[in-house]
């Protein structure tokens, strides 16, 4: 028995930051989970893991140098991720893993969410091209 | 006027807990994320902790995850550093400071610090 | 992690005299960068955020500048009040890192 998760096809995070709501056919209340954001078509870069164990707080940590936050709802979580760079932009697929109480579950792949990173724009004249944003 | 004030450290053996306090005042301490920094002669300043404005997210450097937990009361005004299962390399002095436009920012305002000393 | 490396690691000067602090990082942190200024026995003290952008308070004689991998904290006119170490501090990515420190002593 597979969690199903629902995402946005597409967001585009104006201001380097973005917030990405993963919807599960699952309610999170009272379980300990492991939600993780992974970034790529192959998920080979795990941006961002939200951990829930009963208590009240959510611990969230990345590995990758991601600055992320998460908000838990019932049967979501959202992440929210900052200070994102133009060639971040990429497919990002969410994750769910149950581990208590059993039996453990995990989510079908779902079809993942384009974050499209778009640069601040500015205005420099043609003759003084401004620095550009990585 | 913003105003960060920490307390509750001290010298404890290893293995040994502690909680710092952090009272704030001069501002809406509700918005705002909170963080720790600790800071050594060694390794100079090194980020610890961090938790969102209700206090329903935290994170932490991997060097003290499992054994440190951060909270707030945002009633009080006052964030809370539990450490337990203290190491010598925790000997530190201690600081809260406040993110700048409430998450991942830069620290706007820092408190005076508490010692830890982890001895034997 | 980002690692920050900051030189020179001291500079001594006399009052009057301008100060030039580098800080340079691993990989770029676009401008992402704070400079902070500690005196002995207080708390670190934001100077400038966002590479350039000078805090609430701060004299005009500090002013940063860079962006990428490459940054520097100017003082124009070192004042007796302005020796102190100064630290820079990324936020690009996480976790949160800080440079080793230049300390600005009176020649």
């Known amino acids: 028995n597979k969690i199903l998760v629902k995402q946005s096809p597409m967001l585009v995070a104006y201001d380097n930051a973005v917030n990405l709501s993963c919807k599960y056919s699952y309610n999170l209340f009272s379980r300990e989970f492991r939600a993780s954001l992974h970034k790529g078509l192959d998920s080979a870069v795990e941006v961002c893991v939200v951990y829930g164990n009963y208590s009240q707080q959510l611990q969230v940590y990345s590995k990758t140098g991601f600055n992320c936050d998460g908000k838990l709802g019932n049967e979501s979580v959202t992440f929210y991720l900052q200070n994102l760079y133009v060639n971040q932009t990429d497919i990002y697929f969410c994750k769910i893993e149950v581990m208590y109480p059993p039996p453990y579950l995990d989510n079908e792949k779902s079809n993942g969410t384009i974050i499209h990173v778009k640069g601040k724009h500015l205005c420099p004249s043609p003759l003084f091209p401004g620095p550009s944003k990585p | 006027e913003v105003q960060l004030v920490e307390s509750g450290g001290g010298l404890v053996q290893p293995g040994g807990s502690l909680r710092l306090s952090c009272a704030a005042s001069?501002?809406?301490?509700?918005?705002?994320?909170m963080h720790w920094v600790r800071q050594t002669p060694g390794k100079g300043l090194v980020w610890v902790s961090r938790?969102?404005?209700?206090?329903?997210?935290?994170s932490f450097a991997d060097s003290v995850r499992g054994r440190f937990t951060i909270s707030r009361d945002n009633a009080k005004n006052t964030l809370y550093l539990y450490m337990n299962s203290l190491r010598a390399e925790d000997t530190a002095i201690y600081y809260c400071a406040r993110a700048d436009s409430s998450t991942w920012s830069h620290f706007d305002y820092w408190g005076q610090g508490t010692l830890v000393t982890v001895s034997s | 992690e980002i690692v920050l490396t900051q030189s020179p690691a001291t500079l001594s000067l006399s009052p009057g005299e301008g100060a030039t602090l580098s800080c340079r990082a691993s990989?770029?942190?676009?401008?992402?960068l704070a400079w902070f200024q500690q005196k002995r026995g207080q708390a670190p003290r934001l100077l400038i955020y966002?590479?350039?952008n000078r805090a609430t308070g701060i004299p005009a004689r500090f002013s940063g500048s860079g962006s990428g991998t490459d940054f520097t904290l100017t003082i124009s006119s070192l004042e007796p009040e302005d020796f102190a170490v100064y630290y820079c501090q990324q936020r690009s990515n996480w976790p949160p890192t800080f440079g080793q420190g230049t300390k600005v002593e009176i020649k």
């Open positions: 990989q770029s942190v676009s401008s992402y």
């Open positions: 001069g501002f809406t301490f509700s918005t705002y994320w």
């Open positions: 966002d590479a350039s």
């Open positions: 938790i969102n404005s209700d206090g329903s997210s935290a």
